[in-house]
């Protein structure tokens, strides 16, 4: 868990965590922006979606993403058995039937069309590093977060609790 010796300490537990219900406990339609207020946008190009991080013009409409929140039981780190608590996992869908996926081999974030039940690569553990910011950690690769790299979304490894507050993995959600 964070705040102890580092991110890796809870790797096994995160892999073993299970979604407790097949339906989300809540859903939230919001625009996604970076800590520095750049917008996350989605563009259909050659029958596939591309994800961009960019400054929007003054009156340009922000793209919305449907965040679906799921509860996940978290096995205990302390005893190695039993349930230690619950996590919130989210899936992010900017358009019908498309979800953000973690491509751990390429360290990339991609949009894939898929049917439910969604694969583990589409689930991200939700974090609040700040009161008004969120971060998204890969369910399939603990310690790896969605982040911003070269004006694109990428997967970024975070190796200590101090680095959890680095701006490039912090995002803001807004209804407007």
């Amino acid at each position: 868990a964070f705040g102890i010796s580092g991110v890796q300490k809870y790797t096994r537990a995160l892999h073993d965590s299970s979604i407790t219900g097949i339906s989300p406990i809540t859903e939230y339609l919001a625009s996604l922006s970076t800590y520095n207020d750049q917008s996350i946008t989605f563009a259909l190009e050659d029958e596939s979606y591309e994800i961009y991080v960019e400054d929007l013009k003054k009156d340009e409409k922000k793209d919305k993403v449907l965040l679906s929140y799921y509860e996940s039981q978290h096995p205990s780190n302390e005893s190695g058995d039993g349930v230690d608590g619950k996590m919130l996992m989210v899936t992010l869908s900017p358009t019908k039937d498309f979800w953000l996926h973690a491509n751990n081999k390429e360290h990339s974030v991609e949009l894939h069309k898929c049917e439910k039940p969604l694969p583990d690569q589409a689930f991200f553990v939700l974090h609040n590093m700040h009161s008004n910011c969120v971060s998204f950690e890969c369910k399939t690769d603990p310690g790896v977060f969605i982040g911003v790299k070269d004006n694109h979304l990428a997967l970024i490894k975070v190796d200590s609790s101090e680095n959890l507050c680095t701006e490039n993995i912090l995002f803001k959600l807004s209804e407007t």
Epitope: Y28, D84, K86, L88, N132, L164
Partner: antibody, heavy 121, light 106 residues
Framework: EVQLVESGGGLVQPGGSLRLSCAAS????????MYWVRQAPGKGLEWVAA????????YYPESVKGRFTISRDNAKNSLYLQMNSLRAEDTAVYYC??????????????WGQGTLVTVSS | DIQMTQSPSSLSASVGDRVTITCRAS??????LDWYQQKPGKAPKLLIY???NLQEGVPSRFSGSGSGTDFTLTISSLQPEDFATYYC????????FGGGTKVEIK
């Protein structure tokens, strides 16, 4: 079993200071947002302070900002509330509470039994 | 800061009654809202989270609804152990409680 046990309450004069403690057990303390909530005698609940799992950020309402400081020691599974420049209106039962989920600020899933702070001359 | 206004501040009801408590936020909070129950001399207990989800162990006679600024806690058939004070709580922007609703025996 999740347990939160507050201590440190008592009688203090106006302008004085007090430090409350909350001993946590039964869960991975370093992974949760933690809170202090108070309740004046015969009144409602008031959120007083919040702190992130790694203690990187802390938050307060205007009523206590600049006078109260929340902190935590993850190695000791302990939460603290340092209260300075105390006023009569700070008289209340102070509860320690834990977030419902790992890493997120949503919901106060577990509460301690509370400790009474009385500010009076 | 977001203000939470609860109504009524108190109500009298009988066992078996359907009870409704409302909470209004000063600005939209989506469904980032909980309901808590508190009995005299005891710590509050989480009943409903994210507006409508029942906390484990809470009887199904409790339900929550609403989104945006207006929320409702309903007790479908009041039981003797339900006489208590109920609070709403938002965590969309900062954190704040409603003033509470005391449910008393008629």
């Amino acid at each position: 079993e999740v347990q939160l046990v507050e201590s440190g309450g008592g009688l203090v004069q106006p302008g004085g200071s007090l430090r409350l403690s909350c001993a946590a057990s039964g869960f991975t303390f370093s992974s949760y947002w933690m809170y202090w909530v108070r309740q004046a005698p015969g009144k409602g609940l008031e959120w007083v302070a919040a702190i992130t799992p790694n203690a990187g950020e802390d938050y307060y309402p205007e009523s206590v900002k600049g006078r109260f400081t929340i902190s935590r020691d993850n190695a000791k599974n302990s939460l603290y509330l340092q209260m300075n420049s105390l006023r009569a209106e700070d008289t209340a039962v102070y509860y320690c509470a834990r977030g419902q989920y790992y890493y997120t600020k949503y919901s106060l899933g577990y509460w301690g039994q509370g400790t009474l702070v009385t500010v009076s001359s | 800061d977001i203000q939470m206004t609860q109504s009524p501040s108190s109500l009298s009801a009988s066992v078996g009654d359907r009870v409704t408590i409302t909470c209004r936020a000063s600005q939209p909070i989506h469904n980032h809202l909980d309901w808590y129950q508190q009995k005299p001399g005891k710590a509050p207990k989480l009943l409903i989270y994210f507006g409508k989800n029942l906390q484990e162990g809470v009887p199904s006679r409790f339900s929550g609804s609403g989104s945006g600024t207006d929320f409702t806690l309903t007790i479908s058939s009041l039981q003797p152990e339900d006489f208590a004070t109920y609070y709403c709580f938002q965590y969309k922007k900062g954190w704040s409680f409603g003033g509470g609703t005391k449910v008393e025996i008629k």
